[in-house]
């Protein structure tokens, strides 16, 4: 007998062909021999089955000897063996209807788990294989679990259900609610304006929630809130801002913060958390601020950086157009009795300059 796989909510066509390409009598019945539909004269008649209001046939193909049955809005309980009686012969078709749904909302926070549940007819033993938009393959039986969703899991998941060498494909759209970046570092010279941006990795028609930037300055013994805000239909309103530093916040998305000037006492790392309406849990983005200061005091030229720097970063002081250079994998470098000229302080990572500050040393007579 032929096996046909169907998807819950979809439409399926069960085919039945007569040997002669002409209009003839036919009937479709279920396994309990209850008539579903058939032909009487030139008219389609329906029997007392539960399918009667969802079953149909292509009348236009009857004179070609094709007596298919179309079942709309498939239900799991439509799974059955259907019998087509035509020209004194019986054709059996086994229909297996499957459903695949996400156990919760398909808009999930990064780090939350996704569970896909397969609805299947009794007696079936299907296998499921899902492929994430990022190419991750996950296999399972009745349930498939993704324990910790990542940004790259956002998009259309393609799941294939297999039974009796037949397959049916499901597509499920998953939106992972996250910031575009988990972490970012801003490098600034002392006194420069600092811009922090927190773009989201998703778009929602209505975006409402609240948030906070919590900051741990390198020089401070404890962390504190720098700003709290509300978000109503993508409009940002500041709730409370600390007096020092006095941050400014953009009124529209993406979330955007401005620190009037970079100062050593502000260097450190922060965590922006965003709580979205009707979601338990929060989105997080780490942000780091590294501040550079170059100073000359008496016979000492010093360059310092504050904030979270990796030990492999190099800090150097170099005299422009001269070979004189002092380099260290440290947070401060200095030159005693520096030559007159324009000195450059450079913070670099494997030769790539992250931050530079120039300071002019005037000759002392």
């Amino acid at each position: 007998k032929k096996v046909v796989l169907g998807k819950k909510g979809d439409t399926v066509e069960l085919t039945c062909n007569a040997s002669q390409k002409k209009n003839t009598q036919f009937h479709w019945k279920n396994s309990n021999q209850i008539k579903i539909l058939g032909i009487q004269g030139l008219f389609l008649t329906k029997g007392p089955s539960k399918l009667s209001d969802r079953a149909d046939s292509r009348k236009s193909l009857w004179d070609q000897g094709c007596f298919s049955m179309i079942i709309k809005n498939l239900k799991i309980e439509d799974s059955d063996t259907y019998i087509c009686e035509v020209e004194n012969k019986k054709e059996e078709v086994e229909l297996l209807v499957f459903g695949l749904t996400a156990n919760s909302d398909t808009h999930l926070l990064e780090g939350q788990s996704l569970t896909l549940t397969l609805e299947s007819p009794p007696g079936s033993s299907p296998s499921v294989k899902c492929r994430s938009p990022g190419g991750k393959n996950i296999q399972g039986g009745r349930t498939i679990s993704v324990p910790q969703l990542e940004r790259q899991d956002s998009g259309t998941w393609t799941c294939t259900v297999s039974q009796d060498q037949k397959t049916v494909e499901f597509k499920i759209d998953i939106v992972v609610l996250a910031f575009q970046k988990a972490s970012s570092t801003v490098y600034k010279k002392e006194g420069e304006q600092v811009e922090f941006s927190f773009p989201l990795a998703f778009t929602l028609e209505k975006l409402t929630g609240s948030g906070e930037l919590w900051w741990q300055a390198e020089r401070a013994s404890s962390s504190k809130s720098w700003i709290t805000f509300d978000l109503k239909n993508k409009e940002v309103s500041v709730k409370r801002v600390t007096q020092d530093p006095k941050l400014q916040m953009g009124k529209k998305l993406p979330l955007h913060l401005t620190l009037p000037q970079a100062l050593p006492q502000y260097a450190g790392s922060g965590n922006l958390t965003l709580a979205l309406e009707a979601k338990t849990g929060k989105l997080h983005q780490e942000v780091n601020l590294v501040v550079m200061r170059a100073t000359q005091f008496q016979e000492n030229l010093t360059c310092e950086v504050w904030g979270p720097t990796s030990p492999k970063l190099t800090l150097s002081l170099k005299l422009e157009n001269k070979g004189a250079t002092v380099s260290k994998q440290a947070k401060a470098v200095w030159v005693l009795n520096p030559e007159a000229g324009m000195w450059q302080c450079l913070l670099s990572d494997s030769g790539q300059v992250l931050l530079e500050s120039n300071i002019k040393v005037v000759p002392t007579w």
Partner: antibody
Framework: EVQLVESGGGLVQPGGSLRLSCAAS????????MSWVRQAPGQGLEWVAN????????YHVDSVKGRLTISRDNAKNSLYLQMNSLRGVDTAVYFC????????????WGQGALVTVSS | DIQMTQSPSSVSASVGDRVSITCRAS??????LAWYQQKPGKAPKLLIY???GLQSGVPSRFSGSGSGTDFTLTISSLQPEDFATYYC?????????FGQGTKVEIK
């Protein structure tokens, strides 16, 4: 270690005045909003007032407006609650608390000062 | 003013039990909600901030959830030191308001 110590509580007649103080230590007092919260005997907590870092922004619950006033002196690391025209319903333990927690939570509390308004 | 309603007002439980306390705000407060524990004669202690954030030093058996108007504090396995009164508090708009409290008693 963060510490908040209230003082100035006691017995006062209806219509009388009292000034509660809260001495802060173990943190940069001038960097935090501060609150007063009270608790009547056997009752729940009631937020009374709060004040911003430099003292020029203040909020009070309607039931105490014009009678209880929050203030601070950053040079002395102190928070105050000036209580005038006191009534029986003001009888409570008054706690000072730091608004230093994430999401505006009150992360440190003093041990409380009992104010009894009775004739 | 935003009214905060806690339920139940008291709960009798045994050590090891799972206890849930709910708090409902009279209007949406996003995640501006904190939970406090208070023992007799002591000051309240912050447990949860921002509806679901666990305050540093608080045991992980305490958890918070919810957003908008409905919030829950859950103690996954009640310990002897957890018998106390618990309060929710909104920091969405002034005046800040507390729930009436939920007393967790020994059964």
């Amino acid at each position: 270690e963060v510490q908040l110590v209230e003082s100035g509580g006691g017995l006062v007649q209806p219509g009388g005045s009292l000034r509660l103080s809260c001495a802060a230590s173990g943190f940069t007092f001038s960097s935090y909003w501060m609150s007063w919260v009270r608790q009547a005997p056997g009752q729940g907590l009631e937020w009374v007032a709060n004040i911003n870092e430099d003292g020029n922004e203040k909020y009070h619950v309607d039931s105490v407006k014009g009678r209880l006033t929050i203030s601070r002196d950053n040079a002395k690391n102190s928070l105050y609650l000036q209580m005038n025209s006191l009534r029986g319903v003001d009888t409570a333990v008054y706690f000072c608390a730091r608004e230093g927690g994430q999401w505006l939570a009150l992360d440190y509390w003093g041990q409380g000062a009992l104010v009894t308004v009775s004739s | 003013d935003i009214q905060m309603t806690q339920s139940p007002s008291s709960v009798s439980a045994s050590v090891g039990d799972r206890v849930s306390i709910t708090c409902r705000a009279s209007q949406g407060i996003s995640s501006w909600l904190a939970w406090y524990q208070q023992k007799p004669g002591k000051a309240p202690k912050l447990l949860i901030y921002g509806a679901s954030g666990l305050q540093s030093g608080v045991p992980s058996r305490f958890s918070g959830s919810g957003s908008g108007t409905d919030f829950t504090l859950t103690i996954s396995s009640l310990q002897p030191e957890d018998f106390a009164t618990y309060y929710c508090q909104q920091a969405n708009s002034f005046p800040w308001t507390f729930g009436q409290g939920t007393k967790v008693e020994i059964k």
